[in-house]
C-alpha cells in the first residue's frame, strides 16, 4: 500500500516522493533497500535526499531500484517504499506505454491536460507542449500555468501530449519530460425546460379571410436525446384531433439539430379557409419534456386588404 | 380532489399479461405524465415507465423493455399499464403516480410524484 | 442510471428527537440550468401508496408537517424529523427525477426506540 512506482530517463531530473506523508517538521531518512545504506542529503551528489523527497540530478539507468523512506516523529516510525526505474532515451519518436502518465479526457467546455508530477519540481514558465512529438502551434494551444488548453477541442485532439520544463537546483539546470495520454469525449447530452423559439408570447398573427394560414410552434429541449419531448397546438385549451374542426389539422415538421446541438421540434397548424370564426379562437404552442409544460399564446386577426386608390 | 383510481387485484398465470387501468379525476390529464412504479413483497420501489398522455410518449425502463406497454385514453381520462410474460418475479403491488407541478398561467415546472393510486396487486402463480 | 444509496437501513429514534435519513446519488442530480437539484423524498406506511414530502431537494410539499425539512446539493442529501412523533413510523425513499431511468434509494426503516 505505501509502495510508489516512478519512472524517468537517463539525463534528466526525477524528483520521487516518500508515499508516506507526516507534517514538515518531521525528520524523513532515505535508503537504498538492497544495501541498506543511508542516501546522503548533501546536494553536491548526485542522487540526494531532501526531506520528503529524493532527488536524481540527474538520473542514471544505474538508479534504478527500490528505496525506502522512513518518516520519524517523536511518536512512530513510518515506513514507505519508492520503486525507481530510469529508462534510455527512446531514439524514436514513440513514447512506450511504461512512461506514460495517467489519461486525461476532455470536452468542448474542458480541455485542461496537467504536466505531470510537476509540482514536485523547481520550475519556471513557460512549458513546452508537444503532441505526438511535434511542438504545439497556433492560437488554439495555450500554455498557462502548469496545464494546455486546447480550444474547442476536436476529435482529432486526441493523442500523446508531452510537456517538457528546466528544474533549476542551486543555479544548475536539468530538463524533465513528461508524457500522458488525451482522450476526446462527446459532451453528454442534457435537457432544458423548453424553450419555444416560435411564436412570440402573446404574438398576433395577421390572416386574411378565405386564405390557407401556418402558425409554427417552435421549441428546443436541450442537446443530444431527449426523453418525452413534444410540441403541440391547442384550439381553446383542446386538443387539435378532439376539437372537431377538420379545417385546422397539425403537422408534425422536422426534428431539427442545430449546429450548435440543439434537439429542437417543430408542429406546424394549417389552417384552410379562414373564417371569421377562427379570429375568436385562443390558439396555444405547447412545448414540454420531463421538465416542464411552456405555453405560448396566439391570436389570429384580419388582414386588412392593400386600398388602391388612383 | 385530485385523484387516481387503479383497477382491482389480479391473479394470473406465468407466461400471460396484465392490463393494469389507473382512472384520473379532478385535474386536466393532458397536461401531466403519469409514471408507473412497482413494488415487490418487502422490497423497495422500482420505476417501470412513463407516459406524457397528449402526445402519447413513452420511455420505459430498460428492464421492462419490451414487455411492457404504457397507454393513456384522453377521453376517459384513463393511463394503462399492460405487462407481458408475466413471471413469479412480477408479483407485486403496481402504483401509477402523477407527475408534481408547479403551475403558472404559461409554465408547469414538474417534480417527483405527487399523487399516487392506491395500487392493484397483481399475483402470478401457477 | 443513477444508483441513489440511502443510509442507514434502519433507524430506532425516541419520539421527540431528532430522525436524520442520509441519501446518496451516484452522480450529480443538479441541473446547473436552473440551479435545482431534481431530488425527492416519499413516506410510505404499511398498505398504503407513497406520499410526496419534499421535492427539488428541500421543497415541502403542501399539507407536510413542517417538523420534515430537506436539504443537501449534488450528490448528497438529507431529510431530518426534527421531533419524531408516532405517526412518522414508516419506510423512506429519495428518489432522483435529474434523468431516466428514474430511481429510487433502498429505503430507510424509522421505528420508535
Known amino acids: 500500500k505505501f509502495s510508489k512506482q516512478s519512472w524517468g530517463l537517463e539525463n534528466e531530473a526525477l524528483i520521487v516522493r516518500c508515499p508516506r506523508q507526516g507534517k514538515p517538521s518531521y525528520t524523513v531518512d532515505w535508503y537504498y533497500s538492497q544495501t541498506n545504506k543511508s542516501i546522503p542529503t548533501q546536494e553536491r551528489n548526485r542522487v540526494f535526499a531532501s526531506g520528503q523527497l529524493l532527488k536524481f540530478l540527474p538520473a542514471a539507468v544505474a538508479d534504478s531500484g527500490i528505496y525506502t523512506c522512513i518518516v520519524r516523529s517523536p511518536t512512530f516510525n513510518r515506513t514507505g517504499y519508492a520503486n525507481v526505474t530510469i529508462y534510455k532515451k527512446q531514439s524514436d519518436c514513440n513514447v512506450p506505454d511504461y512512461l506514460m502518465y495517467s489519461t486525461v479526457s476532455g470536452s468542448e467546455k474542458n480541455s485542461k491536460i496537467y504536466c505531470p508530477t510537476i509540482d514536485l519540481y523547481n520550475w519556471t514558465a513557460p512549458l513546452e507542449w508537444f503532441k505526438n512529438c511535434q511542438a504545439l502551434q497556433g492560437s488554439r494551444y495555450r500554455a498557462h500555468k502548469s496545464f494546455l488548453v486546447i480550444d474547442n477541442v476536436m476529435t482529432e485532439d486526441a493523442g500523446d501530449y508531452t510537456c517538457k520544463f528546466i528544474h533549476n537546483e542551486n543555479g544548475a539546470n536539468y530538463s524533465v519530460t513528461a508524457t500522458r495520454s488525451f482522450t476526446v469525449k462527446d459532451e453528454q447530452g442534457f435537457s432544458l425546460f423548453p424553450v419555444i423559439g416560435a411564436p412570440a408570447q402573446n404574438e398576433i398573427k395577421e390572416v386574411e379571410i378565405g386564405k390557407n394560414a401556418n402558425l409554427t410552434c417552435s421549441a428546443c429541449f436541450g442537446k443530444g436525446t431527449q426523453f418525452l419531448a413534444a410540441v403541440l397546438w391547442q384550439l381553446n385549451g383542446t386538443k387539435i384531433t378532439d376539437f372537431g374542426e377538420p379545417r385546422i389539422q397539425q403537422e408534425e415538421g422536422q426534428n431539427q439539430s442545430f449546429s450548435n446541438g440543439l434537439a429542437c421540434l417543430d408542429m406546424v397548424l394549417r389552417i384552410a379557409d379562414v373564417k371569421e370564426e377562427d379570429l375568436l379562437l385562443q390558439y396555444d404552442c405547447l412545448a414540454l419534456n420531463l421538465h416542464g409544460l411552456r405555453r405560448h399564446t396566439v391570436r389570429l386577426s384580419r388582414k386588412n386588404p392593400i386600398d388602391h386608390h388612383s | 380532489q385530485v385523484q387516481l383510481v387503479q383497477s382491482g387485484a389480479e391473479v394470473k398465470k406465468p407466461g400471460s399479461s396484465v392490463k393494469v387501468s389507473c382512472k384520473a379525476s379532478g385535474y386536466r390529464f393532458t397536461d401531466y405524465y403519469i409514471h408507473w412504479v412497482r413494488q415487490a413483497p418487502g422490497q423497495g420501489l422500482e420505476w417501470m415507465g412513463i407516459?406524457?398522455?397528449?402526445?402519447?410518449?413513452?420511455t420505459y425502463a430498460q428492464k421492462f423493455q419490451g414487455r411492457v406497454t404504457i397507454t393513456a385514453d384522453e377521453s376517459t381520462s384513463t393511463a394503462y399499464m399492460e405487462l407481458s410474460s408475466l413471471r413469479s418475479e412480477d408479483t407485486a403491488v403496481y402504483y401509477c403516480a402523477r407527475v408534481g407541478a408547479t403551475v403558472t398561467k404559461n409554465y408547469y415546472y414538474y417534480y417527483g410524484m405527487d399523487v399516487w393510486g392506491q395500487g392493484t396487486t397483481v399475483t402470478v402463480s401457477s | 442510471d443513477i444508483v441513489m444509496t440511502q443510509s442507514p437501513d434502519s433507524l430506532a429514534v425516541s419520539l421527540g428527537e431528532r430522525a436524520t435519513i442520509n441519501c446518496k446519488s451516484s452522480q450529480s442530480v443538479l441541473y446547473s440550468s436552473n440551479n435545482r437539484n431534481y431530488l425527492a423524498w416519499y413516506q410510505q406506511k404499511p398498505g398504503q401508496p407513497p406520499k410526496l414530502l419534499i421535492y427539488w431537494a428541500s421543497t415541502r410539499e403542501s399539507g407536510v408537517p413542517d417538523r420534515f425539512s430537506g436539504s443537501g446539493s449534488g450528490t448528497d442529501f438529507t431529510l431530518t424529523i426534527s421531533s419524531l412523533q408516532a405517526e412518522d413510523v414508516a419506510v423512506y425513499y429519495c428518489?432522483?427525477?435529474?434523468?431516466?431511468?428514474?430511481?429510487f434509494g433502498q429505503g430507510t426503516k424509522v421505528e420508535i426506540k
Open positions: 407516459i406524457q398522455p397528449t402526445g402519447g410518449g413513452t
Open positions: 428518489q432522483q427525477y435529474y434523468s431516466v431511468p428514474l430511481t
